[in-house]
Interface confidence: low
């Protein structure tokens, strides 16, 4: 077993490790979300700027402050262009969000065009009919029952967005769309010990060859991408869409980064790669806005004048606009998108944020100097609710993303989205999707809590995002009821 | 894990030619692609070739293009690097590295093979 002397030999403070466990005992036994630790950890040293940690017996850095952060993630990111996740890269392993740096570099160029303004003013119209469709699903149910628990709800709605703006697939029923979820679920939801394995023992599942995915999440997005390809006789179809870009790239049979020069770095685009791709888009673009949604629902129930001032301006901007929810009237809505905003300083779902130093690396204004390989965390939930940066930090204030308010604030003080060049590729399309939806709830719907609304919402333990516990129970009142 | 190991470095006069093998074994089929690469002392390594196990393509790195040439032998697991034309600076540490699928870095390397050119 490795000791743990490791940080008290460089002098850097840090929380008493465990046997075995490190600092990590809690989400290592799935007591508490892995994101909820980090922000305790973080608190726990409110005056350094770097904290020496031990998930399970792996020494790591917790930065908590903001300027060594910048230097992280945008001025130094050639250090750190690695997430340092090690494991197989068969498989679903060589996905966008996985990948080591320099494939990372080869992948992010050919997919950054798919979030263009002009490719994501195509996919609103999907996201539109996606939206009608769920409205007209919620007006049916209010008819039998008010309450609904919004986190699986809201699900029903994204998956069917990212399937058709990605994939070109039309799920018809609730049926189809709940059979998909709980196969893709499983990624999110299914305790796998795998991370906690590459935390004792860094690469072994690389060298084992071993996945931290499902075999049955494999498969279904293996069915997925055949499916999908033999439709379009593997050939891009003129849709544009995500599935397009990928047999665009299935015909070039390769991607190339920069590193050695050109064929040399290149990747082989097999149809495990788009496997892979397919795999990070369908997960990142359906729990991540659902469960954002499902928070700001909640808030909104809780908060109602905060409520009244986002329907007043929805009903202002709707009636300039006959009735009709566009693209650009989802932008020029400024009080709903700082809403949004502040939902996800409260609740930022992708916890902790992680990169791999590629070489030996002083630590801007500190002595420390980090070991090649190392891996450097950062808790955007620590930051994100120390009364440093936000005054009253548990309170939900969308005033705080005033511009006034924005401009005043570190730049690394919110990070829902990371940050710097490989910060998330899909951050538009997430508020897109999920403004589009809220837009249309509130137009139509008021939110009140419900005799099941737990006040004091818990993260779940078991989720490798931040998500509610037990879900989330509001009551949606038609507001044709409401006087 | 995917086992290197290179052979046929050793000192030669300049204009001479040298043949360079690397013999994988363990878990080949995970390789996608093998490279050659050279450390010079004082330098960084440096990619000269690569070749791809399936389809047999071909990089070169400017500096030896003409005067290196990489292949291999599916039946042997071997890759061998064949240079002509030797010169003073290419005296070096030569590595034989692999590539897995799904990755662009070289994640399996052997020991080296010191390669002295003398004037």
């Known amino acids: 077993m490795r000791t743990f002397n490791y940080w008290k030999k460089r002098n850097v403070r840090g929380p008493e490790p465990v046997v075995f466990f490190g600092n990590l005992k809690d989400s290592a036994l799935r007591k508490k979300n892995m994101g909820v630790v980090m922000e305790e950890l973080y608190n726990m040293f409110p005056e350094e700027k770097v904290i020496g940690i031990y998930r399970m017996t792996s020494p790591c850095l917790l930065v908590r402050d903001l300027d060594v952060i910048k230097h992280i993630m945008i001025k130094d990111f050639e250090v750190f262009s690695d997430r340092g996740v090690e494991f197989s890269k068969e498989g679903l392993g060589s996905n966008l969000f996985h990948a080591d740096g320099e494939t990372w570099r080869a992948l992010g160029n050919r997919f950054t065009p798919i979030f263009t303004s002009g490719k994501l003013k195509n996919m609103f119209y999907l996201m539109h009919e996606g939206a009608d469709n769920f409205i007209d699903h919620v007006s049916a149910e209010c008819e039998k029952n008010q309450e609904f628990e919004v986190h699986s709800l809201l699900q029903t709605y994204t998956m069917s967005t990212i399937a058709a703006c990605a994939f070109g697939i039309s799920y018809d029923s609730i049926g189809d769309k709940v059979k998909a979820l709980d196969i893709v679920d499983k990624i999110i939801s299914e305790p796998s010990y795998a991370i906690e394995l590459d935390m004792m023992y860094p690469g072994l599942l690389s060298k084992l060859n071993l996945s931290i995915f499902p075999t049955v999440v494999k498969n279904f997005f293996k069915s997925l991408v055949d499916n999908i390809v033999a439709q379009r006789n593997g050939k891009p179809s003129g849709r544009n869409d995500f599935m397009d870009l990928i047999l665009e790239l299935r015909q070039l049979g390769e991607v190339t980064s920069n590193k050695y020069g050109s064929s040399a770095s290149s990747l082989e685009i097999t149809d495990e790669v788009i496997c892979a791709q397919a795999f990070v888009f369908y997960i990142a673009g359906y729990e991540t806005s659902a469960t954002t949604m499902a928070y700001m629902i909640y808030q909104l129930a809780l908060n109602p004048d905060i409520q009244n001032k986002l329907i007043a301006e929805v009903d202002e901007v709707l009636k300039a606009n006959d009735g009709k929810v566009t693209y650009d009237t989802v932008k020029e809505m400024k009080y709903l998108n700082k809403a949004f905003d502040e939902t996800l300083r409260m609740y930022s779902i992708v916890e902790p944020l992680q990169r791999k130093a590629t070489r030996d690396y002083k630590i801007p204004g500190t002595d420390v100097v980090i070991e090649k390989d190392t891996i450097v965390l950062i808790s955007p939930r620590g930051i994100h609710y120390d009364p440093k940066y936000y005054d009253n930090p548990k309170q939900f204030n969308p005033d705080r993303f005033d511009a006034e308010e924005v401009g005043k604030r570190h730049p690394c003080a919110y990070l829902p989205f990371g940050l710097g060049q490989r910060n998330c590729i899909g951050m538009r399309f997430g508020r897109l999707q999920s403004l589009l939806c809220i837009t249309k709830i509130l137009s139509k719907f008021r939110i009140e809590p419900s005799k099941n609304t737990d006040r004091n919402l818990q993260v779940e333990p078991h989720r490798g995002l931040i998500g509610p516990k037990g879900g989330i129970r509001v009551n949606a009142i038609p507001r044709k009821l409401v006087s | 894990q995917v086992q290197l190991q290179e052979s046929g470095g050793g000192l030669v006069q300049a204009g001479g030619s040298l043949r360079l093998s690397c013999a994988a074994s363990?878990?080949?089929?995970?390789?996608?692609?093998m490279g050659w690469f050279r450390q010079a002392p004082g330098k960084e390594r440096e990619l000269v070739a690569d070749?791809?196990?399936?389809?047999?393509?071909?990089y070169y790195s400017d500096s030896v293009k003409g005067r290196f040439t990489i292949s291999r032998d599916n039946a042997k697991n071997t890759v061998y690097l064949e240079i002509d034309s030797l010169k003073p600076g290419d005296t070096a540490v030569y590595y034989c590295?692999?590539?897995?699928?799904?990755?662009?870095?070289?994640?399996?390397w052997g020991q080296g093979t010191q390669v002295t050119v003398s004037s």
């Open positions: 070749i791809a196990w399936s389809d047999g393509r071909i």
């Open positions: 590295a692999s590539r897995a699928r799904g990755t662009v870095l070289y994640n399996y």
């Open positions: 363990g878990r080949t089929s995970r390789s996608y692609a």
